[in-house]
Interface confidence: medium
C-alpha cells in the first residue's frame, strides 16, 4: 500500500489506482531553503540541483560535532517529500536547494532574506516556468522577512511555508504570518492536528490550510537508499509545495491567487477535530486538509471564494479591524464577529484604490474581527452602495440600481452603542433580490458587482427562537459570496462564511437568560458565473492530455518497500 | 560582483559634511521605526537589516551605508556592511553596536531597521 500521507492527498477517485506517474510537476521548479542535502540519495538524485548559495550561522556549543548525515537530514527528507521517486508528491518536479539552516537546523532572518534575493536575481537572469519556493522554517514575527516574501510573491513566485511547530498562533511567526505566503499546518493520519512533544502545529487565521505532517516517510540522509519517518509543519508544507507544483504544471498560467483558491477549494473540508485548538482560535483556523484536484478541467468554471479574517481589533472603544483580499481578488462581501456581541457592525471602504472590510468595536466590547469574502472574478467591476440610517420603522434598505450589477454582499454599520431589540422586518419584499435590509438605526452597505455572466441569488434560513448558531449553505454549483444576519440586534455575535456555508452566531441563551429577542436569520448570497463555465467548456473541447486527470490515468506505479529507519 | 565602496574619498567628504552640519536630513514627517524579535532568546543583537524606502536605488543604498559608517566612525564606532540588498528590498545588512540605532534611524531614505533574529527548521 502507498504511505498514508500520499493516499490522503490523492483524490478518492484515484485511490484504487494507487498514485500518479513520475512526471507530475515537470514544468515547475521548486526552490528549497533549508539545511544542506544529500543530493545523491536515490529518491532525489538528478532531481535536485544544489546551488552554491549558503548563508548559515555558526553552530552553537563548543562540543558540537558536524556530522554530514545530521547536517543533511531535514533538507533531504523534505526534498524527498516534494519530488522523491517513490515517496514524493510531485515526482516530476525539479528542485534547487539553498542552504540557509546550519547543522542544528538554525538560520537567521538576514540569511533567509539574502537567499530570497538570490532566487529573485536567478529568476531575472534566467526566467524559467512557474517557481515554487518552499520555506520549511520559522522565526519570530519579522516585518522585513514578510516584506521580502510579499515582493517575491508579487514577482509571480509561489511561496509555501511551515506554520510552525509551537502550538501557537501562526501570526506570531514569520514567514508564516506573511499574507502572500501559503502557510501550512500539520495533521496526522486521523486528520487530527499534529502534537510534537509538548507542542504541536501552529494554528489561527494566518494558516491557509493543513496537510499531512506526522510520521511522513521520506529520504533519510543516513544512506543513499535509506528512508525515515519525520514529523512537523515542514513536512506538511512540502506536501503543499508538491501539490502546487502539480497544479502549476497542469496550468502554468495560474496566478498565486488562483492557486491558493484552488488549494482551498480542493481540500478536504471539516475533517479536523477543532477541539485540539484553543477555543478562541477555532473559528479562525481553517478546517481544510490539502488534496490534489481530481482534474484541472472543470475547475475553470467555478467561482472561487475564500474567507479572510482580520487580526483582532483590541478592546478600545473606537478600535477597528481590517480584513483585506489579495491584489488579484475581489472583495465581494464583508461581515464582522465579536465574542462578546458588543460591536458596531462593519462596512466596506476604499483604501489605496481597493476595497477593504472594516469592523467596528463597541463600548464595553472585548474587540471585533472583520471577515472578508475574497473571490476570483475576472473583469469584475464592483462598487459599494450605502444607505444612511432610515429612522423609519421599516428599517434601512439599499439595492443595486445599476444595470447589470448584482448583489454579492450586505454589510451594516451603526454608530449607536446598542441596537437593542428594535426589529426591522425579517423578510424583504418579494421580487427585490438585489436589496440589503437592515436595522433602521444602521447604515447599510451593498456590494454590487458587474462581471460577465455573473448571477446571484439570496438564500435565507430563519429560526424563530434564538439559537447559538444558524447556518445556510449554497447548493452545488453555486458559491457563497455574502453572509450576514437579520436582524442586526445585540444578541447576534456576528456572521462569517465557512467554505460554502454562512454561519450566524448568537449569544448563548442559557447565559443571557433572555428569549425575547426573537428570530435570527442567516442570509447567504450565492453566486455563479455562466461566463466562466462557458470558457471552461470551450477549453475542454480544444485541449486534451494536459490535465491532472490524464496524468493520473496515464500510468500506475507501485509503492516500493524499502528498509525504513525511524527516529 | 559589486564593489560597494566606489570612491574612498566619498567617505572623507561625508565625514566633513557631517562636521560642517551639511549632511542631508531625513524627509520631514517620516519617522523610521525599529523592530526586533518578540522572543528574546531568538534575538541577534549587533546585526541589523536597514530597510530603505521602496524606490531607493542601489547607489543610494550604498551611499546611505557609507554615510552610516562615516557618522559612526566620528563617534568612535566601527560598522561593517555585510550585504547590500537590491532586487527584492532596498537596504543593507550591517554589523554595528546597538548604540548607533538612533543615528541610523535618522539617515535619509531609511524606512525601518530590524534587528536580526534566528529562524529554525520546522
Amino acid at each position: 500500500s502507498i504511505p498514508w500521507n500520499l493516499e490522503r492527498i490523492t483524490p478518492p477517485r484515484y485511490r484504487a489506482d494507487e498514485y500518479q506517474p513520475p512526471d507530475g510537476g515537470s514544468l515547475v521548479e521548486v526552490y528549497l531553503l533549508d539545511t544542506s542535502i544529500q543530493s545523491d540519495h536515490r529518491e532525489i538524485e538528478g532531481r535536485v540541483m544544489v546551488t552554491d548559495f549558503e548563508n548559515v550561522p555558526e553552530e552553537d556549543g563548543t562540543r558540537f560535532h558536524r556530522q554530514a548525515s545530521k547536517c543533511d537530514s531535514h533538507g533531504t527528507h523534505l526534498a524527498g517529500v516534494v519530488s522523491g521517486r517513490d515517496a514524493g508528491v510531485a515526482k516530476g518536479a525539479s528542485m534547487r536547494s539553498l542552504r540557509v539552516l546550519n547543522c542544528q537546523g538554525k538560520g537567521t532572518v538576514s540569511g533567509t532574506l539574502i537567499g530570497l534575493e538570490f532566487i529573485r536575481k536567478s529568476q531575472l537572469v534566467q526566467p524559467v516556468g512557474p517557481l515554487v519556493v518552499l520555506l520549511p522554517l520559522a522565526g519570530g514575527y519579522s516585518r522585513v522577512l514578510n516584506a521580502a516574501c510579499q515582493r517575491l510573491a508579487r514577482a509571480g513566485v509561489v511561496l509555501v511555508t511551515a506554520a510552525g511547530n509551537f502550538r501557537d498562533d501562526a501570526c506570531l511567526y514569520s514567514p508564516a504570518s506573511a499574507p502572500e505566503v501559503i502557510t501550512v499546518g500539520a495533521t496526522n493520519a486521523q486528520d487530527q492536528p499534529v502534537t510534537l512533544g509538548t507542542l504541536g502545529t501552529n494554528f489561527g487565521r494566518c494558516v491557509d490550510l493543513f496537510a499531512p505532517g506526522e510520521d511522513i516517510i521520506g529520504a533519510s540522509s543516513d544512506c543513499s537508499t535509506c528512508f525515515v519517518s519525520q514529523s512537523g509543519t515542514s513536512q506538511a508544507a512540502a506536501h503543499v509545495a508538491g501539490i502546487a507544483a502539480m497544479m502549476l504544471s497542469a496550468e502554468p498560467e495560474l496566478t498565486l491567487a488562483e492557486l491558493r483558491q484552488r488549494l482551498i477549494h480542493f481540500s478536504a473540508k471539516d475533517v479536523i477535530n477543532e477541539a485540539w485548538f484553543p477555543e478562541d482560535q477555532r473559528v479562525l483556523t481553517p478546517n481544510l486538509v490539502a488534496a490534489l484536484p481530481p482534474s484541472t478541467h472543470g475547475a475553470g468554471w467555478q467561482l472561487f471564494c475564500r474567507t479572510v479574517w482580520s487580526a483582532h481589533s483590541g478592546p478600545t472603544r473606537m478600535a477597528t479591524a481590517v480584513a483585506r483580499c489579495a491584489p488579484d481578488e475581489e472583495l465581494l462581501s464583508c461581515s464582522s464577529f465579536s465574542r462578546s456581541g458588543k460591536r458596531r457592525g462593519e462596512r466596506m471602504e476604499a483604501q489605496g484604490g481597493k476595497l477593504v472590510c472594516r469592523a467596528h468595536n463597541a463600548f464595553g466590547g472585548e474587540g471585533v474581527y472583520a471577515i472578508a469574502r475574497c473571490c476570483l472574478l475576472p473583469q469584475a467591476n464592483c462598487s459599494v452602495h450605502t444607505a444612511p440610517p432610515a429612522e423609519a420603522s421599516m428599517g434601512t434598505r439599499v439595492h443595486c440600481h445599476q444595470q447589470g450589477h448584482v448583489l454579492t454582499g450586505c454589510s451594516s454599520h451603526w454608530e449607536v452603542e446598542d441596537l437593542g431589540t428594535h426589529k426591522p422586518p425579517v423578510l424583504r419584499p418579494r421580487g427585490q433580490p438585489n436589496q440589503c435590509v437592515g436595522h433602521r438605526e444602521a447604515s447599510i452597505h451593498a456590494s454590487c458587482c458587474h462581471a460577465p455572466g455573473l448571477e446571484c441569488k439570496v438564500k435565507e434560513h430563519g429560526i424563530p427562537a434564538p439559537q447559538e448558531q444558524v447556518t445556510v449553505a449554497c447548493e452545488e454549483g453555486w458559491t457563497l459570496t455574502g453572509c450576514s444576519a437579520l436582524p442586526g440586534t445585540s444578541h447576534v455575535l456576528g456572521a462569517y462564511a465557512v467554505d460554502n456555508t454562512c454561519v450566524v452566531r448568537s449569544r448563548d441563551v442559557s447565559t443571557t437568560g433572555s428569549t425575547s429577542e426573537g428570530a435570527v436569520t442567516a442570509v447567504a448570497i450565492c453566486c455563479r458565473s455562466r461566463h466562466l463555465a462557458q470558457a471552461s467548456q470551450e477549453l475542454q473541447g480544444s485541449t486534451s492530455g494536459s490535465g491532472l486527470n490524464d496524468i493520473f490515468e496515464a500510468q500506475k506505479i507501485e509503492w516500493h518497500e524499502h528498509h525504513h529507519h525511524h527516529h | 560582483q559589486e564593489d560597494e565602496d566606489g570612491d574612498y574619498e566619498e567617505l572623507v567628504l561625508a565625514l566633513r559634511s557631517e562636521e560642517d552640519g551639511l549632511a542631508e536630513a531625513p524627509e520631514h514627517g517620516t519617522t523610521a521605526t525599529f523592530h526586533r524579535c518578540a522572543k528574546d532568546p531568538w534575538r541577534l543583537p549587533g546585526t541589523y537589516v536597514v530597510v530603505l524606502k521602496e524606490e531607493t536605488h542601489l547607489s543610494q543604498s550604498e551611499r546611505t551605508a557609507r554615510r552610516l559608517q562615516a557618522q559612526a566612525a566620528r563617534r568612535g564606532y566601527l560598522t561593517k556592511i555585510l550585504h547590500v540588498f537590491h532586487g527584492l528590498l532596498p537596504g543593507f545588512l550591517v554589523k554595528m553596536s546597538g548604540d548607533l540605532l538612533e543615528l541610523a534611524l535618522k539617515l535619509p531614505h531609511v524606512d525601518y531597521i530590524e534587528e536580526d533574529s534566528s529562524v529554525f527548521a520546522q
Partner: antibody, heavy 121, light 107 residues
Framework: QVQLVQSGAEVKKPGASVKVSCKAS????????IHWVRQAPGQGLEWMGE????????KFNQKFKDRVTMTRDTSISTAYMELSRLRSDDTAVYYC??????????????WGQGTTVTVSS | DIVMTQSPSSLSASVGDRVTITCKAS??????VAWYQQKPGKSPKLLIY???NRYTGVPSRFSGSGSGTDFTLTISSLQPEDFATYFC?????????FGGGTKVEIK
Amino acid sequence: QVQLVQSGAEVKKPGASVKVSCKASGYTFTGYTIHWVRQAPGQGLEWMGEINPSGTYTKFNQKFKDRVTMTRDTSISTAYMELSRLRSDDTAVYYCARERIYSNYWFFDVWGQGTTVTVSS
Amino acid sequence: DIVMTQSPSSLSASVGDRVTITCKASQNVYTAVAWYQQKPGKSPKLLIYSASNRYTGVPSRFSGSGSGTDFTLTISSLQPEDFATYFCQQYSSYPYTFGGGTKVEIK
C-alpha cells in the same frame, strides 16, 4: 582545528592572470568574511580586499579595483582571488585571512600559509 | 588612505628587555588598531585587537595602548621566541592599511 590552506606557488608572465585559492576547514565557511593581503619581498603588508560571508558583496582597495576578482564556492568552502594583467611588481606572497567579528571589534584571527606568485618574463 | 607610520623600523634588544614599538595614524582611527607578529617565511599572527585587547593565547607580556592617532605595542620582557617583525594595522576605514613593520633582532 580552524585553518585556511592556500594553493601552491605560481610563476606567471606579465599580462597573464593568476587565481589563488584558499580552502577553509574547522569552521562554518559562510559565517566569516575572507580578506586578501599581499606582501612583496622584504616589504610590508598590503590589504587587497574582502568578500562577505555569502559571496554577495565585495570591497576592494582602489589600487586593485580594476584587476582583482574575489569569489567563493561555498560547496567546497573555498575562496578565490584572481589578479589579472600581472606586472612584475605583483610578485609577492598572497595571503587569505579570516575576519572575526567580536562585539564592536574585528580582526584577522586566522591566516593562510601564503601563496608565492612570481611574475617574470 | 590612512597612513600608518611605524617606528622604529628595526631595533636590537636582549632577552628580558622591555621593548616599545609605536604606530602613528595620519588621521583619527579611534581604537580600530590591531598588532600582528610575523616570523620569516610564516604568515602573520594576531597579538592585539582594538588597540589594547590581548587575543586568546597571547602571553601577558604583550600589551597594547593608545587611541585616536597614537598607538603603542609593549613587550614587557623580551623572550627568545619574540624575535620577529611586528606590524600595526588600522581597520577604522577602507582601505585597511598596515604600518611598515618593526623588525626586532637579537642584540
